[in-house]
Interface confidence: low
């Protein structure tokens, strides 16, 4: 009967197993849950620069198999895949990044992301991260926050393009102007020319609505207000699908665009279609002696 | 264990800038958000601003105009600048990691440099 | 900006027994952005509950976290000698961080 001490001692070990996912034993964390969690934060953003390399990372943390992970950019309301984009894993000591690579950052890059990871048959999504690209070829040139709302930026778009011929007509304009000013020392020129006039103009803040994010330079996203960035000065309004712009200031100059009359909006328009053009003016060059 | 060490003048004049920096030991400066947080004598905290690792950073309104936080991953340090001090400025001034995973509190602190400002 | 209101000011008790702390916010907060921290004189100040009502690391269960949307509270079930301290609650809000005013617990 020498085995018996052997069998009772099979039976205690074989109650020692069973009784373990019961006591806990297993979770090192202690009360921590083993459902896959992603740790990005509700309204976190990230201001970067055009042409930086920069990596989006998705905070997750898993108990045994790691879950598999997408990113996706935010869309209006769908939230479209990145399947394409470079990615890759990196372990820390007691959380994993699963990582967007951006190499480099492109102006078109700014816009919301979101993680989401396939556990179980189960689909987990992320809080939104919201990406803010500085194009640094543009940052010399930027409107100030009083211009934000007010400036058309597809004229921004189409100056390189348009500049040109408006540069040749206007020389061409101030050489008939001159010429005749010449030839009839008295005579002024009426009219040389649609020259685009910088005006000081007086801007309001105008309450904007919007329910859906827009892909554009000025992103309307579900995060706060971005103090730091000065063309990023929309805030949604907590508990409401309002968005306002509160970084205009009454009775702050600012310099207005004349328009170019193209009702064309792509999708380089930085301008969020629902923000209202100010008023354009124009003016005449007089040439005087 | 993580330790933040803050560096910096005591003493400096009105309508100049205080600079401070704060550096890590023990651990990296990789994933978090790092703040600053003052405290005038005798009063509360005030949050001053963050930066994360990767340069962007957010600022408490109220002193945005003269503050700037920047960060340099090369040498585990990031820095406070806070320009056209006043006599308000006086506080003791520390740098403190936020866990940057789904909850936002301040685990680890400095243990306070105090900043006069006079002349 | 959300404001947090700590009552009272000033708490008086002897050591072992309850103290409660309370944190009122302006407008609503989630409780996952809700910390309580200790701080006591000459000292920097340390995470006691994040989330909340999630202990930090190395701090004793006395030590208890309740509340959502406007109304949280701190309780220390009993009083130890080293309790007696400045207690400060701590939001994210929509756009920055706020503490409140702080709440001094003395030994009566």
């Known amino acids: 009967m020498k085995t018996l001490p052997a069998m009772l001692g099979t039976g205690k070990l074989f109650w020692v197993f069973f009784l373990i996912p019961y006591l806990d034993i297993w979770n090192i964390h202690g009360k921590e849950s083993c459902d896959v969690q992603l740790y990005i934060k509700r309204q976190s953003e990230h201001s970067i620069l055009a042409g930086d390399p920069f990596e989006l990372e998705c905070p997750v943390k898993y108990c045994a198999n790691r879950p598999h992970v997408t990113w996706c950019k935010l869309n209006g309301t769908t939230c479209v895949k990145l399947e394409d984009r470079q990615t890759s894993w990196k372990e820390e000591k007691n959380i994993s990044f699963f990582i967007l690579h951006f190499e480099p950052v492109l102006p078109n890059d700014n816009g919301s992301y979101r993680c989401s990871a396939n556990f179980q048959s189960n689909l987990i999504e992320s809080h939104s991260t919201t990406l803010y690209v500085t194009d640094v070829k543009s940052a010399s040139e930027r409107p100030s926050k009083d211009e934000m709302a007010s400036r058309p930026w597809l004229l921004y778009r189409l100056l390189p393009l348009g500049g040109l011929p408006l540069l040749i007509t206007t020389c061409f304009c101030l050489f008939c102007c001159l010429r005749r000013h010449q030839g009839k020392q008295n005579e002024l020129s009426d009219t040389a020319g649609r020259e685009i006039n910088l005006v000081d103009a007086h801007l309001k803040s105008e309450q904007t609505e919007a329910s859906t994010r827009q892909n554009s330079q000025v992103l309307l996203s579900e995060t706060g207000i971005y103090d730091n960035d000065p063309d990023l000065c929309f805030r949604m309004q907590e508990g409401s699908e309002v968005y306002s712009n509160p970084c205009l200031e009454e009775n702050k100059p600012g310099i207005v665009y004349a328009s170019l009359n193209h009702s064309v909006i792509g999708p380089n328009s930085r301008l969020a279609r629902n923000v209202k053009e100010a008023p354009t003016e124009y003016a005449s060059i007089c040439v005087r002696s | 264990q993580v330790q933040l060490q803050e560096s910096g003048p005591g003493l400096v004049k009105p309508s100049e800038t205080l600079s401070l920096t704060c550096t890590v030991h023990?651990?990296?400066?990789?994933?978090?958000?790092w703040s600053w947080i003052r405290q005038p004598p005798g009063k509360g905290l005030e949050w001053i601003g963050y930066?994360?690792?990767?340069?962007?950073?957010k600022y408490n309104p109220s002193l945005k105009s003269r503050v700037s936080i920047s960060v340099d991953t090369s040498k585990n340090q990031f820095s406070l600048k806070l320009t056209s001090v006043t006599a308000a400025d006086t506080a003791v001034y520390y740098c403190?990691?936020?866990?940057?995973?789904?909850?936002?509190?301040?685990?680890?602190w400095g243990q306070g440099t105090t900043v006069t400002v006079s002349s | 900006e959300i404001v947090l209101t700590q009552s009272p000011g000033t708490l008086s008790l002897s050591p072992g027994e309850r103290a409660t702390l309370s944190c009122r916010a302006s407008?609503?907060?989630?409780?996952?952005?809700l910390a309580w921290y200790q701080q006591k004189p000459g000292q920097a100040p340390r995470l006691l509950i994040y989330?909340?009502?999630s202990r930090a690391t190395g701090i004793p269960d006395r030590f208890s976290g309740s509340g959502s949307g406007t109304d949280f509270t701190l309780t220390i079930s009993r009083l130890e000698p080293e309790d007696f301290a400045v207690y400060y609650c701590?939001?994210?809000?929509?756009?920055?961080?706020?503490f409140g005013q702080g709440t001094k617990v003395e030994i009566k």
């Open positions: 403190a990691r936020e866990w940057p995973y789904y909850y936002y509190e301040m685990d680890v």
């Open positions: 023990g651990g990296s400066i990789n994933h978090y958000y």
């Open positions: 930066i994360y690792y990767s340069g962007s950073t």
């Open positions: 407008q609503s907060v989630s409780s996952s952005y």
């Open positions: 989330g909340a009502s």
């Open positions: 701590q939001q994210y809000g929509s756009s920055f961080r706020t």
